[in-house]
Amino acid sequence: HTAAQDNCTCPTNKMTVCSPDGPGGRCQCRALGSGMAVDCSTLTSKCLLLKARMSAPKNARTLVRPSEHALVDNDGLYDPDCDPEGRFKARQCNQTSVCWCVNSVGVRRTDKGDLSLRCDELVRTHHILIDLRHRPTAGAFNHSDLDAELRRLFRERYRLHPKFVAAVHYEQPTIQIELRQNTSQKAAGDVDIGDAAYYFERDIKGESLFQGRGGLDLRVRGEPLQVERTLIYYLDEIPPKFSMKRLTHHHHHHHHHH
């Protein structure tokens, strides 16, 4: 696992402890909470980040309308079970033996059940819609400038391949970023859209996960882009399985930023 060799730190994840006792005597950084070694040359998986967070001492319109199957993260934070590669296990359970199935971004996609609940496979979230509302500005941002800046951000800061940023929509004051990544499209070494979206979400909230880097300073042609609300929708390759009672209520998990 690579890391800054000179001082043994993890540039991409400050929720780690690093020591020079990895394979070949190299620097090895372990995620808090799980103790799993992470690859510091890329983003850490959302599952390991959530686990680290929970262990730490004690958020004809051009706009896309989310489909009826879009999931929003209503359950908030939990201490997840991660597989040996650091991905979410398909079935998650809490301390009181309440279990549920999650998708690849760790969002619940079934009703809650007991220990007999089966989750046969980890269903991939292949489409993420990041819905932002920016603070009032003197005028609207230029759409193409905004598009270019957000694509640059995902490419350079999160190392997400440009082909996975499907579109950037803008209708002042709402910005929507669409990330798409099918199982067949994701090659070894590619950053997962779920991980990129999580890093972006934490950046927007002023809780950057990067080591020693300043917070996110988003500017479009020099003009600060300040987000006051984010809402993230997750669409899975297989639609979620909720009871009809759940589907009659449209729950949203809002993140407010001040």
Epitope: C8, V17, S19, D21, P23
Partner: antibody
């Protein structure tokens, strides 16, 4: 050369607490994990937990979480483990070891819990 | 928690023979396995780290192999001083665990 030197044997009564020390020398104390492992008579090795001296981040085996405390004093390059509410089955040799692959071990501290 | 299962529990061989000790993990742990030798009344001694990396001062007759879930410690030609208990240990994630040990005894 790297050395881990532990404190001497202890005899304790059930319900008491014991604190064992591990003094490190010959390397940068703050940059390597210190692990604690125990071995009951005639038994195998059991990992108790670990501490990273640089920031005192400690991780405990769930089995011991409510009874064990690990600390480190960087000024004297010494790690400590304290086990409370001792029971007879805590009788064991307690070892400290360095790094994720336990490349250097202390000589062991025998803790006997007996009424 | 990752469970490490060592086999056999006891291995009876003669000096000069080849010893093959096995350690199986309950899930994929890459190469995060380490091997130790322990003699009565002594602290364990590291023999192999990260499945196959040799340790300074350890005789070359000790070697390790494997990745994922199956690991092997091989002693190419047993010397009298090699008869001891051998443990594997993983450092993949917390909690770290040890195998139950393989006792290598003289036949």
């Amino acid at each position: 050369q790297v050395q881990l030197v532990q404190s001497g044997a202890e005899v304790k009564k059930p319900g008491a607490s014991v604190k064992v020390s591990c003094k490190a020398s010959g390397y940068s104390f703050t940059t390597h994990w210190i692990h604690w492992v125990r071995q009951a008579p005639g038994q195998g090795l059991e990992w108790i937990g670990t501490i990273f001296p640089s920031n005192a981040y400690a991780v405990y085996n769930q089995k011991f979480r409510d009874r064990v405390t690990m600390t480190a004093d960087r000024s004297i390059s010494t790690a400590y483990i304290e086990l409370s509410r001792l029971r007879s089955d805590d009788t064991a040799v307690y070892y400290c070891a360095r790094a994720s692959y336990f490349d250097y071990w202390g000589q062991g501290t025998t803790v006997t819990v007996s009424s | 928690e990752i469970v490490l299962t060592q086999s056999p529990a006891t291995l009876s061989l003669s000096p000069g023979e080849r010893a093959t000790l096995s350690c199986r993990a309950s899930q994929n742990i890459g190469t995060s396995i380490h091997w130790f030798q322990q003699k009565p009344g002594q602290s364990p001694r590291l023999l192999i780290k990260y499945a196959s990396e040799s340790i300074s001062g350890i005789p070359s007759r000790f070697s390790g192999s494997g990745s994922g879930t199956d690991f092997t410690l091989t002693i190419s030609s047993l010397e009298p001083e090699d008869f001891a208990v051998y443990y594997c240990q993983h450092s993949h994630s917390w909690p770290f665990t040890f195998g139950q040990g393989t006792k290598l005894e003289i036949k």
